[in-house]
């Protein structure tokens, strides 16, 4: 029996066999040696490299009573779920005494139906928009030829004749399914079926039609939606005066947007309940039965200024001889813009009214004409922005001032219902 004591006298009495099978196969390679004395550890090589993580078991059977008698050593390497990376030449390696011995080789091969490395994926595409699908398969055996199918209909006359790894689709007008078949000498494997959902194209030309302090009217042009009519469009508006910096293509606004739905047609919508004199960003997407289009880029818009919604507050008017002292506070109601100043009007019972622009001051001293005997003198004040005057206050009568007395304050009891300009008398 071989002892492995002389140079190149192999101790191996059984060498690894050959395994050829399809992916996923489980198999075992086996080698056997007969040695004298302590049995060595058997290592496995694949293509000349020691397998660091080998699923191997070693069995040792003594052929005699003494430790120095012969031993039969069997090593088995288990290959679970055969993959391409498992293929190659396998050998057993032992270090015996001062020598290294390698068994005769066995081979592991892979042969079966094609195996997909890449399959078409589900995706959404805009109507009439080109896109690509990928499919890749390998043997062995090679060659592997691909055949693409759309809605179960082959796109070429035979495998290998049409597009192979990449299928270019110039555009779809309805939701469709795609798959690919991989053909080799062993047969055919069919990939998963990818559903390509056709969504409406992104709307175009989003623009402002008209502006009011609290309303914006916007319009857009719908994109193509294939065979699926648009059911509605959704418009979003978000405040942009806080340095939020929405970029042209930024996907999500940083705060909860104001969302409105528009029936279509017309492709137009009035957005209400907005803040006057405020920058916004708006965008629109349109939806069919298949789903929503992508959003348009954010469009910066701004509501115009309005007039103040209420009169100045806490107006006080006192008279001291030929002088009258009037002061007031800023309106509590929204200004709807930038306050530019105040207008004041005063009038006696039988005298023409006098109109003054006070600017941004909130008090004024009036020089009254004559000896101050004008009776029933009243004062009104209004705030104004670039958009115009707000409502005038109710007339406040001038009261005689007596030293030591607190100045009388006339509260505004009733605000005019309309902000339109009108003289209060």
């Amino acid at each position: 029996a071989p002892r492995g004591t002389q140079a190149e006298e192999s101790p191996f009495v059984g060498n690894p066999g050959n395994i050829t099978g399809a992916r996923g196969l489980t198999g075992t390679l086996r080698c056997q040696l007969q040695v004298q004395g302590e049995p060595p550890e058997v290592h496995w090589l694949r293509d000349g490299q020691i397998l660091e993580l080998a699923d191997s078991t070693q069995t040792q059977v003594p052929l005699g009573e003494d430790e120095q008698d012969d031993w039969i050593v069997v090593s088995q390497l288990r290959i679970t779920s055969l993959q391409l990376s498992d293929t190659g030449q396998y050998q057993c390696l032992v270090f015996l005494g001062h020598q290294t011995f390698v068994s005769q080789p066995g081979y592991v091969g892979l042969e079966g139906l094609p195996y997909f490395l890449e399959e078409p994926e589900d995706r959404t595409v805009a109507a009439n928009t080109p896109f690509n699908l990928s499919c890749q398969a390998q043997g062995p055996p090679e060659p592997v030829d691909l055949l693409w199918l759309q809605d179960a209909v082959p796109l070429a006359t035979a495998p290998g004749h049409g597009p192979q790894r990449s299928l270019h689709v110039p555009g779809l007008n309805k939701t469709s399914s795609f798959s690919c078949e991989a053909h080799n000498a062993k047969g055919v494997t069919t990939s998963r079926t990818a559903t390509i959902t056709v969504l409406p194209q992104q709307p175009r030309n989003l623009h402002l039609v008209s502006r009011q302090p609290t309303e914006l009217e916007v319009a857009w042009t719908p994109g193509l939606s294939g065979i699926y009519p648009l059911t509605h469009c959704t418009l979003q508006a978000v405040l942009s005066d806080d340095g939020m910096g929405i970029q042209a293509g930024e996907p999500d606004p940083p705060e909860e947007p104001l969302t409105s739905q528009a029936s279509v047609p017309p492709h137009q919508l009035r957005l209400g309940s907005l803040h006057p004199h405020t920058p916004y960003h708006i965008r629109v997407a349109c939806t069919s039965s298949q789903g929503p289009s992508s959003w348009t880029h954010w469009l910066p818009v701004e509501t115009p200024e309005g007039v103040p919604l209420g009169p100045p507050e806490n107006i006080s008017a006192t008279r001291n001889g030929s002088q009258a002292f009037v002061h007031w506070q800023e309106p509590r109601a929204p200004l709807q813009g930038t306050l530019l100043g105040y207008r004041l009007a005063y009038q006696g019972q039988d005298t023409p009214e006098v109109l003054m622009d006070i600017g941004l001051r909130q008090e004024v001293t009036l020089e009254l004409q004559g000896d101050g005997s004008v009776s029933n003198l009243t004062v009104c004040v209004a705030a104004y922005t670039a958009a115009g005057d707000g409502p005038w206050s109710l007339p406040v009568p001038l009261e005689a001032w007596r030293p030591g007395q607190a100045q009388p304050v006339h509260q505004l009891v009733k605000e005019p219902s309309t902000p339109a300009f009108s003289w209060p008398w």
Epitope: H43, D47, Q89, Q91, T100, P105
Partner: antibody, heavy 118, light 112 residues
Framework: QVQLQQPGAELVKPGASVKLSCKAS????????INWVKQRPGQGLEWIGN????????NYNEKFKSKATLTVDKSSTTAYIQFSSLTSEDSAVYYC???????????WGQGTTLTVSS | DIVMSQSPSSLAVSAGEKVTMSCKSS????????????LAWYQQKPGQSPKLLIY???TRQSGVPDRFTGSGSGTDFTLTISSVQAEDLAVYYC????????FGGGTKLEIK
């Protein structure tokens, strides 16, 4: 009896290419790595690279990647090293050697003396 | 890449003397799977091919006189010739085969 046979000498002109051979016998040629080693006159040993005959898998010393190409012919159990664009720096003795997985026995060819001269 | 450094580059001794030469590797040469140290020593006499003396750091090749001894572990290795003979005139190289191959620069042994 394991043997690695190499021709004794080769004379080539600068700029030319040459293919040196190493004929193996006495063992299963496809089961052991063949290494190639360079030794310039009066200098040390430099490992060039190796090749596994069964799969023709190769490894190279970075220094020789663009200079040397290792191949085998399994049918004749012969390993080859091909050099391109030869210069006088390539004049050396080239040894082929069988690797026994870091152990023993260890086999070396006698070496081929390559002279690059016009 | 693993770098191998040998010292001294040359030494001259009289016959019968003991000689030691050193080889250092830039990383450990111990393979945990096979539990072998992949370090070999070669002797190259003038005009000859290199000849294996020691492998696995300390295992003497069959037929090599027992005056040659290899030792060391990890990254530091030594070749000792206990009593130098005239026929030991040669260059001695260490070689790692833990990851591909790398040779040391060699130690030239001369006899006084």
């Amino acid at each position: 009896q394991v043997q690695l046979q190499q021709p004794g000498a080769e004379l080539v002109k600068p700029g030319a290419s040459v293919k040196l051979s190493c004929k193996a016998s006495g063992y299963t040629f496809t089961s052991y790595w063949i290494n190639w080693v360079k030794q310039r006159p009066g200098q040390g040993l430099e490992w060039i690279g190796n090749i596994y005959p069964d799969s023709s898998s190769t490894n190279y010393n970075e220094k020789f990647k663009s200079k040397a190409t290792l191949t085998v012919d399994k049918s004749s159990t012969t390993a080859y090293i091909q050099f391109s664009s030869l210069t006088s720096e390539d004049s050396a003795v080239y040894y082929c050697t069988r690797d026994t997985y870091g152990g023993s026995p260890d086999y070396w060819g006698q070496g081929t003396t390559l002279t690059v001269s016009s | 890449d693993i770098v191998m450094s040998q010292s001294p580059s040359s030494l001259a001794v009289s016959a019968g003397e003991k000689v030691t030469m050193s080889c250092k590797s830039s990383q450990s040469l111990l393979n945990s799977r096979t539990r072998k140290i992949y370090l070999a020593w070669y002797q190259q006499k003038p005009g000859q091919s290199p000849k294996l003396l020691i492998y696995w750091a300390s295992t003497r090749q069959s037929g090599v006189p027992d005056r040659f001894t290899g030792s060391g572990s990890g990254t530091d290795f030594t070749l000792t010739i206990s009593s130098v003979q005239a026929e030991d005139l040669a260059v001695y190289y260490c070689k790692q085969s833990y990851n591909l191959w790398t040779f040391g620069g060699g130690t030239k042994l001369e006899i006084k």
